[in-house]
Amino acid sequence: DTHKSEVAHRFKDLGEEHFKGLVLVAFSQYLQQCPFEEHVKLVNEVTEFAKTCVADESAENCDKSLHTLFGDKLCTVATLRETYGEMADCCAKQEPERNECFLQHKDDNPNLPPLVRPEVDVMCTAFHDNEATFLKKYLYEVARRHPYFYAPELLFFAARYKAAFAECCQAADKAACLLPKLDELRDEGKASSAKQRLKCASLQKFGDRAFKAWAVARLSQKFPKAEFAEVSKLVTDLTKVHTECCHGDLLECADDRADLAKYMCENQDSISSKLKECCDKPLLEKSHCLAEVENDEMPADLPSLAADYVESKDVCKNYAEAKDVFLGMFLYEYARRHPDYSVMLLLRLAKAYEATLEKCCAAADPHECYAKVFDEFQPLVEEPQNLVKQNCELFEQLGEYKFQNALLVRYTKKVPQVSTPTLVEVSRNLGKVGAKCCKLPEAKRMPCAEDYLSVVLNRLCVLHEKTPVSEKVTKCCTESLVNRRPCFSALELDEAYVPKAFNAETFTFHADMCTLSEKEKQVKKQTALVELVKHKPKATKEQLKGVMDNFAAFVEKCCKADDKEACFAEEGPKFVAASQAALA
């Protein structure tokens, strides 16, 4: 399906609004430090050029690839060297190396100020004064902070953002209407970004075979009535979409995602009974709905897998003839029977089955060798089941904040070399698994919990790759995607770690503590907790609890004092001394 002008093709397929939005997202994800106005200027130039190509596909430069056109445009930025340093060297390269170079310089933790939410009236005025600029600013600010955000999904978030302002800026109580909606968009956006980051890591670090295996398992759980051939077709298309988005090919990605949604809605009968309500929605909402659709009901009478995958005399023959197809069918059959398993567990089971066949099909008596293969799965299944049970019990006993603290201590002891902000961020997010998953019925707990933990641990891996400090983290992150969580779970106290010297400055607090939000107070306390564990990695739970209780009491006392700063100055050193004594 070749076109004389790729840029004209995508402009016509996507329409001007989506085209401009996606180009802005692409540029913002590549040049994360550039000011908004600079990006808007570049996007307008690209859009004007695209229109000339729509008018005449043979016009000069219209035959160039999108990477060439976009890369040339990015390389016109005057301050490239001063702002981005060695990223400017990318511009000396030819495509496709230039795009690869830009991709490698995407920064998962850019040094950007946290977004401050203005007063509601200020936001509503800005929205009414220039709606288009207001929405572009949203795309820009999110994209530059989340350089792997799933671009077509970001357009959906922007549409919801617009709808929230359109509705709430007319409301009697603007704040009561708007703020919960913005909070929800922020939380959903962060979750969406992290999920997409795992997909991109899977493709980039472990290859498309790893992503396809993940997709086979997940889609087989979602669509257990679909035939294997149908699931395989969806997996192939989905892999193309995510490969494109993760590779910065956002126009192609959005176009192919729309095609996939169209295909699914035209073939509902052979996919799932749950697609109906998604397919009546407009494009962005439809694609989002299809991605989030609940699992269809399992067919009533699925037979055991033993006949085809253990008892059949053709197991090794079928495996040898087409290894990936045979394993794919095994994964499909297993996953459609087990919506109660995490995708990562299903992939571990498929890996174990593959390893058994590799060993046994070369043995003297293959059947005898693999006859008990399913029995070997039991410990693999029980490990995450027990982990979820234990952690949900702990969460129910402690509540979210204290559960996060337990995880902070646990993970700081495992990998004390990791930076404190990273340990706090990751452990806080690990702790959110409780509220998210533990309230669910038994059959939904493991898929919720383990697949969420995989997303959070990927964030740790991504941040650690930028600044590697721990061999243990590198090992867990790089050896096996599906075994990352068990690898981290299995880590013990790092005996080789030399405790961090005590620094009183780290435990010095001021009156500004009192004006912080509850969340910010928690982060301050949790930062102190990590530093304590880094100083005394062998401290007991009781010792740490004692110090944290004293800390809370000290802060509460000083925040109630008339002269708060004086109280912090006087009581702070006493708290530090008492803490050191308690941990001695």
Partner: nanobody, 115 residues
Framework: QVQLVESGGGLVQPGGSLRLSCSAS????????MGWYRQAPGKQRELVAS???????HYADTVKGRFTISRDNSKNTLYLQMNSLEPEDTAVYYC?????????WGQGTQVTVSS
């Protein structure tokens, strides 16, 4: 070794009710399907009702609205509540539990509906 034992069968008049139980002893992990089947003399064994791991229930058209399948995970027990029984429901009722590695059947319990 997994053993399934059905109970609750018997003789009942048309319009009456019975509750079948199937209790599993031994260790069976990774169950994805639990079902009740029946076999009338000279006929094939047929699915009456099943419940899958996702909580979906399925019923044969002939028993819909009259029979209810349920399970008690803590007791490893499967139930079949049979109301408005008809002479055509006369059969041996078997319970079946499946995991990927195998299909486990009980010995069956006789249900006779007759006046």
């Amino acid at each position: 070794q997994v053993q399934l034992v059905e109970s609750g069968g018997g003789l009942v008049q048309p319009g009456g009710s019975l509750r079948l139980s199937c209790s599993a002893s031994g260790s069976i992990w990774g169950i994805y399907h639990m079902g009740w089947y029946r076999q009338a003399p000279g006929k094939q064994r047929e699915l009456v009702a099943s419940i899958t791991v996702d909580g979906s229930t399925h019923y044969a058209d002939t028993v819909k609205g009259r029979f209810t399948i349920s399970r008690d995970n803590s007791k490893n027990t499967l139930y079949l509540q049979m109301n408005s029984l008809e002479p055509e429901d006369t059969a041996v009722y078997y319970c079946d539990i499946r995991n990927v590695g195998g299909d486990y059947w009980g010995q069956g319990t006789q249900v006779t509906v007759s006046s």
